[in-house]
Amino acid sequence: LPAQVAFTPYAPEPGSTCRLREYYDQTAQMCCSKCSPGQHAKVFCTKTSDTVCDSCEDSTYTQLWNWVPECLSCGSRCSSDQVETQACTREQNRICTCRPGWYCALSKQEGCRLCAPLRKCRPGFGVARPGTETSDVVCKPCAPGTFSNTTSSTDICRPHQICNVVAIPGNASMDAVCTSTSPTRSMAPGAVHLPQPVSTRSQHTQPTPEPSTAPSTSFLLPMGPSPPAEGSTGD
């Protein structure tokens, strides 16, 4: 004969545990029903009556099957440097993530506690490590034959254009300027003598907490807080 299915509340067999979505109530010494996500235990079970569940109130939630007397409070509203990627509902907490152009300098269990603006590389420096959701941009000096003339959290150093006749040679922060003949972005092999790369580094500058004006993309979603790199700047 099949074993009879026990209905909650019931006393468990010695040495056995309660079933899935049930909990053992120490006071009643019975297996009782848990409340579903979005609910909490309004009245605990007794030897003769099961748990009474009730819906979570506004701005509170429970994410798991539970027997908590009160639902958890949703986190505070997202700050201005964040976007709400998951709303507060009866079954889930609000999740705030950093908006484009910012990264998470201090994370919490879900979402981000503190966002910081992505470092911007100043002219003469380019992005050597793009930012992600959780790591800042790394800037490095432009190598000989390349330049960056922008203050940007996304721009890498680019090769100088190649002129038939050079009006102004390029440097780390400026492209070459050609005379009226049309430029290309190529060079004949061995046609250029690259100078030694710069070995000086510029002063550290702290990024300012203004939002980034550099073009942001879905890729700007980067490791943790780091001191500003040389060659970085704020607006």
Epitope: A128, K140, I156, C157, F219
Partner: antibody, heavy 118, light 109 residues
Framework: QVQLVQSGAEVKKPGASVKVSCKVS????????IHWVRQAPGQGLEWIGR????????EYAPNFQDRATMTTDTSTSTAYLELSSLRSEDTAVYYC???????????WGQGTTVTVSS | QAVVTQEPSLTVSPGGTVTLTCRSS?????????ANWVQQKPGQAFRGLIG???DRAPGVPARFSGSLLGGKAALTLSGAQPEDEAEYYC?????????FGGGTKLTVL
């Protein structure tokens, strides 16, 4: 001129570790990432990782996260790659390089042959 | 880890045009993958040809060009020369690491 000079060939037993060095000259080592790439016999390139000599920060390919350690000594302008728990599949030529898909500062060491054999 | 796939081998006639491609297992290649192309000739040092998807590195002839084509990174060689016979590797950036493709052996015949 810019040069990256690597240490000599190594023969190791499975399970052992190897440490390859790469001495750079002609530029400030702090200005560019140093990459490590390997090429097994008759195979393509495999990126191991890169280290920022300025602060020691490293980024590894997922396959090397647990076995590779990249370090630099800025006082001697030398980068190091240590690979542990060697197996026969690690037999390859290991290159250090300033090649970085972000910089166009494109110099490579001469390569260090590591042979793993019992 | 992402897998980057290239044609194992291609052949082009001298003076002809050929396009090498680079596919990502994670979806379309975008500018955020900063596609790079590296050339390896037998017995010679590696040489970066293209960076940032479409920028020729200093010293690279104009016959080499980089682009995105149908969700893949592409290297087009227009007016192939005998000296262009080599192995070509693409490299794609994935958030915090580079992945090289298996390489394309280009024969100029």
């Amino acid at each position: 001129q810019v040069q990256l000079v690597q240490s000599g060939a190594e023969v190791k037993k499975p399970g052992a570790s190897v440490k390859v060095s790469c001495k750079v000259s002609g530029f400030n080592i702090k200005d560019f990432y140093i990459h490590w790439v390997r090429q097994a016999p008759g195979q393509g390139l495999e990126w191991i990782g890169r280290v920022d000599p300025e602060d020691g920060n490293t980024e590894y390919a997922p396959n090397f996260q647990d076995r590779a350690t990249m370090t630099t000594d800025t006082s001697t302008s030398t980068a190091y790659l240590e690979l542990s728990s060697l197996r026969s599949e690690d037999t390859a030529v290991y290159y250090c390089s300033t090649w970085d898909g972000f910089s166009y500062f494109d110099y490579w060491g001469q390569g260090t042959t590591v042979t793993v054999s019992s | 880890q992402a897998v980057v796939t290239q044609e194992p081998s291609l052949t082009v006639s001298p003076g002809g045009t050929v396009t090498l491609t680079c596919r990502s297992s994670t979806g379309p290649v975008t500018t955020n993958n900063y596609a790079n192309w590296v050339q390896q000739k037998p017995g010679q040092a590696f040489r970066g040809l293209i960076g940032g998807t479409n920028d020729r590195a200093p010293g690279v002839p104009a016959r080499f060009s980089g682009s995105l084509l149908g969700g893949k990174a592409a290297l087009t060689l227009s007016g192939a020369q005998p000296e262009d016979e080599a192995e070509y590797y693409c490299a794609l950036w994935y958030r915090n690491h580079w992945v090289f493709g298996g390489g394309t052996k280009l024969t100029v015949l």
